[in-house]
């Protein structure tokens, strides 16, 4: 009942649940003293079907005969209309027209599986319902299964259709029976090929052709006997995108020709019995396999640094970048470095494991060349050959107007102007950068990138950290010589966190020499541009004097000669980056002992 029906009742005959096509009688009656007035003709009862008026009557009751109700639920509401007032709801009723079972579909899982059907019961009638599923085949073959569970929507016949006559038509139908009568679904007609969903392929294996070319591998699997179609999907294990291949009459094998070497792949296979009938099987279990190695392709990017040791010796440091995974095509076991003196023919070969750099000492005389290649289990990459030369010797080849500007938290834009002369001789530029580190810098990683001769800028981002200063060099290289220019640069930067620590003040011939400790690298917060030395008379309120010194890496002392003798001064220092000045370092007092003028 709708609401509480305090004012009256609605009754439905024969029942509030009916079969499709049935007629119902709906009556609405007022309870005593619930009308507009004792005079019944002033009571106007109105019957609504949902929001549409379908009947009305003056009096204490109303009767209506309703036909043609659709499947599902229809709401009827009875209202009372009094003169000069809104309509009042009396009572209502929902009438449910039972739906026939719908969307019957059948499937047989595998050639030897059994036929099972599912359907939708339709809206619940709350009546006890039995379902009968019937399957009829050729030559009057019939099977029947019953289900006495009110919520039944699945039955298995327990028989399989045979592939021996795949064209034979079978028809399934489900019938619901309750106290109102019976109703059947639309029949579903199918053949063996329509409803068999093959089992997923099993026993999947992969075989790689002998060493030479990985691009050739064969996938093997087992399938049910009648499978005509397969689809294969495969992808590198670290990828989300599948490559898909459809194959007809593969008979359990297929060659794949585009696999990358030394890559773990995932493979899955699905099957279907017919080009346009039936459904695909589930995907098989995943096969994971790694393709074999192939000899490396590509060439190493090699760079070097020279350092003068003494009149006869120089130190050569070679650096190279790892090959990309696609170039390495396997696990790189070692790098082979060959150093050769071109005039005397002296050759030295070394295998380097676990590093991408090598340092050696060679004579300063002679012409030296190096070749570096990468080796995996299948062979070596083509060697990269370079002639060792003085990279900064040719002043005319030096790029000029080099600048370094912060581009982001972790990148710096380096720009330059080509050499003023010998412009056509430039074969390439190399931009090199390493973290600025006072003292021994042999352990600091070197970074570089190559740029074609027509470029005059490069964005460097590899191993660039914010609040760190880098020494940047731009080399212009020709066939047999090079020129270079350098600059300091940083990405994100801010004022240093502290000022230099004055560790000593000494007097020298009427002036003083201030010595300080460098600001720790992690507190510099970028490239230092200047130091400032401040001083003022002790106990004075006057503005301090200052002296600004351009920053040089190795400098940590500076003279001041403008102090008055026998006056006690307070001195301190600050450091500046492009972003601003640090707080002051420690204060030191000093009194110059020299004679007054």
């Amino acid at each position: 009942k709708i609401d509480e029906c305090k004012r009256g009742d609605v009754t439905v005959k024969p029942s509030r649940v009916i079969l499709l096509g049935s007629t119902v009688n709906i009556s609405c009656s007022l309870k005593p003293r619930q009308g507009c007035s004792p005079y019944s003709r002033r009571n106007k009862l109105i019957l609504y079907k949902f929001d549409r008026r379908i009947n009305f009557h003056h009096g204490h009751s109303l009767n209506a005969q309703v036909t043609g109700l659709p499947l599902g639920t229809t709401l009827f509401v009875c209202k009372l209309a009094c003169i000069n007032s809104d309509e009042i709801q009396i009572c209502g009723a929902e009438i449910l027209v039972g739906e026939q079972p719908q969307n019957l579909s059948c499937i047989q899982k595998g050639e030897q599986g059994t036929v099972a059907c599912t359907w939708e019961r339709g809206q619940d009638t709350h009546l006890y319902t039995e379902y009968t599923l019937q399957l009829s085949g050729p030559k009057n073959l019939t099977w029947q299964k019953q289900c006495k569970d009110h919520y039944c929507d699945y039955l298995d016949f327990g028989i399989n259709l045979t592939p021996e006559s795949p064209e034979s038509n079978f028809t399934a139908k489900v019938t619901a029976v309750n106290s109102l009568g019976s109703s059947s679904s639309f029949p579903s007609t199918f053949t063996f090929l329509d409803i068999v969903r093959p089992l997923p392929p099993w026993d999947i294996r992969i075989k790689f052709q002998k060493a030479s070319s990985v691009s050739r591998c064969t996938l093997y699997w087992r399938d049910e006997g009648l499978v005509l179609l397969n689809r294969l999907r495969y992808r590198p294990s670290n990828s989300r995108h599948w490559n898909m291949v459809n194959v007809t009459e593969a008979r359990g094998r297929h060659d794949l020709l585009d696999l990358k070497p030394f890559t773990e792949y995932e493979f899955q296979i699905s099957s279907k019995l017919h080009l346009y009938k039936g459904s695909w099987s589930d995907w098989s279990e995943t096969l994971r396999a790694q393709t074999p190695e192939e000899e490396p392709t590509g060439m190493l990017d090699v760079w070097y640094m020279k350092r003068h040791i003494d009149y006869s010796r120089q130190q050569i440091s070679l650096f190279w970048k790892n090959l990309s995974v696609s170039e390495a095509r396997g696990k790189i076991l070692h790098y082979q470095v060959t150093l050769q003196e071109l005039t005397g023919g002296k050759v030295m070969t070394q295998n380097i494991t676990g590093h991408t750099s090598w340092t050696t000492v060679i004579s300063r005389t002679g012409n030296w060349a190096v070749a570096v290649s990468a080796a995996n289990s299948k062979g070596n990459s083509l060697p990269t050959r370079i002639n060792i030369m003085n990279l900064c010797e040719a002043g005319l080849l030096a790029p000029h107007q080099v600048s370094a500007n912060s581009e982001s938290m972790d990148s710096i834009l380096v720009t330059w102007q080509p050499p003023r002369k010998d412009l056509s001789a430039v074969q390439e530029y190399v931009v090199e950068w390493r973290q600025l580190h006072p003292g021994d810098d042999t352990q600091i990683p070197l970074n570089w990138l190559r740029s074609p001769p027509y470029n005059v800028s490069a964005l460097i981002s590899e191993n660039i950290k914010p609040y760190t200063c880098y020494e940047i060099r731009v080399y212009a290289l020709s066939e047999d010589q090079g020129g270079c220019s350098s600059i300091l640069g940083n990405s994100e930067h801010k004022a240093p966190l502290s000022g230099p620590h004055i560790n000593a003040i000494t007097e020298e011939k009427g002036s003083i020499l201030i010595s300080w400790n460098s600001i720790p690298v992690q507190e510099q917060m970028g490239c230092l541009l200047h130091y400032r030395i401040y001083w003022k008379e002790r106990d004075s309120n006057s503005q301090p004097q200052l002296c600004e010194i351009p920053y040089r890496v190795s400098q940590n002392s500076h003279p001041i000669n403008s102090l008055q003798p026998r006056v006690t001064y307070v001195l301190w220092m600050t450091a500046l980056t492009a972003a601003g000045e640090s707080s002051q370092g420690n204060e030191r007092e000093f009194c110059l002992q020299g004679k007054a003028n």
Epitope: K139, T162, P163, E164, P166, G225, L226, L228, H274
Partner: antibody, heavy 116, light 107 residues
Framework: EVLLVESGGGLVKPGGSLRLSCAAS????????MNWVRQAPGKGLEWVSS????????HYADSVRGRFTISRDNAKNSLYLQMNSLRAEDTAVYYC?????????WGQGTLVTVSS | DIQMTQSPSSVSASVGDRVTITCRAS??????LAWYQQKPGKAPKPLIY???SLQSGVPSRFSGSGSGTDFTLTISSLQPEDFATYYC?????????FGGGTKVEIK
């Protein structure tokens, strides 16, 4: 009336070839799978090959796979069996039969004799 | 492959006798079993399909039963025209296979 009539049998030397035909009438030939079944003299029945209505599915007994080829021409209501590399053990009466939950109609058979 | 084993290989009986022939499949074949009758020099004649359904025109004295692996052909009252060889055949999966045959002879 359903009628299946085989032809093309005869005497052939080992290693030789023969093509059997089966003419069908009285039913919609293109709606049924068709088969060849053989029976060696004094022996039981042996299924040889099957072909589905639209030739999507073809099956052979292991004993003939690679040597025999089944085919059909729905426009001519005809079934064929091309037999190559014949052996003495292929000597038999060859029947063509229609499939519908078993072999529900059979031809009268044609005798193939393989002998030198 | 599914092997079909028929027994007995031959049976002697008289007109009016009840004759039972059995057929066993090496693996389950559901109901997909057919029975045939063959007389010398003639093509086999289908009797039963789907284990128990009678082909049209076959006398009702012939009946079949069973499912899975064990099947039976019964002739309730043997008639003179029933003396022949009987074969079972599985239609469940390829390759299709026949039993070895049972010869019903006059006692």
């Amino acid at each position: 009336e359903v009628l299946l009539v085989e032809s093309g049998g005869g005497l052939v030397k080992p290693g030789g070839s023969l093509r059997l035909s089966c003419a069908a009438s009285g039913f919609t030939f293109s709606s049924y799978s068709m088969n060849w079944v053989r029976q060696a003299p004094g022996k039981g029945l042996e299924w040889v090959s099957s072909i589905s209505s639209s030739s999507d599915y073809i099956h052979y007994a292991d004993s003939v796979r690679g040597r025999f080829t089944i085919s059909r021409d729905n426009a001519k209501n005809s079934l064929y069996l091309q037999m190559n590399s014949l052996r003495a053990e292929d000597t038999a009466v060859y029947y063509c039969a229609r499939s519908e939950l078993g072999f529900d109609y059979w031809g009268q058979g044609t005798l193939v004799t393989v002998s030198s | 492959d599914i092997q079909m084993t028929q027994s007995p290989s031959s049976v002697s009986a008289s007109v009016g006798d009840r004759v039972t022939i059995t057929c066993r499949a090496s693996q389950g074949i559901s109901i997909w079993l057919a029975w045939y009758q063959q007389k010398p020099g003639k093509a086999p004649k289908p009797l039963i399909y789907a284990a128990s359904s009678l082909q049209s025109g076959v006398p009702s004295r012939f009946s079949g039963s069973g499912s899975g692996t064990d099947f039976t052909l019964t002739i309730s009252s043997l008639q003179p025209e029933d003396f022949a060889t009987y074969y079972c055949q599985q239609a469940n999966s390829f390759p299709l296979t026949f039993g070895g045959g049972t010869k019903v002879e006059i006692k």
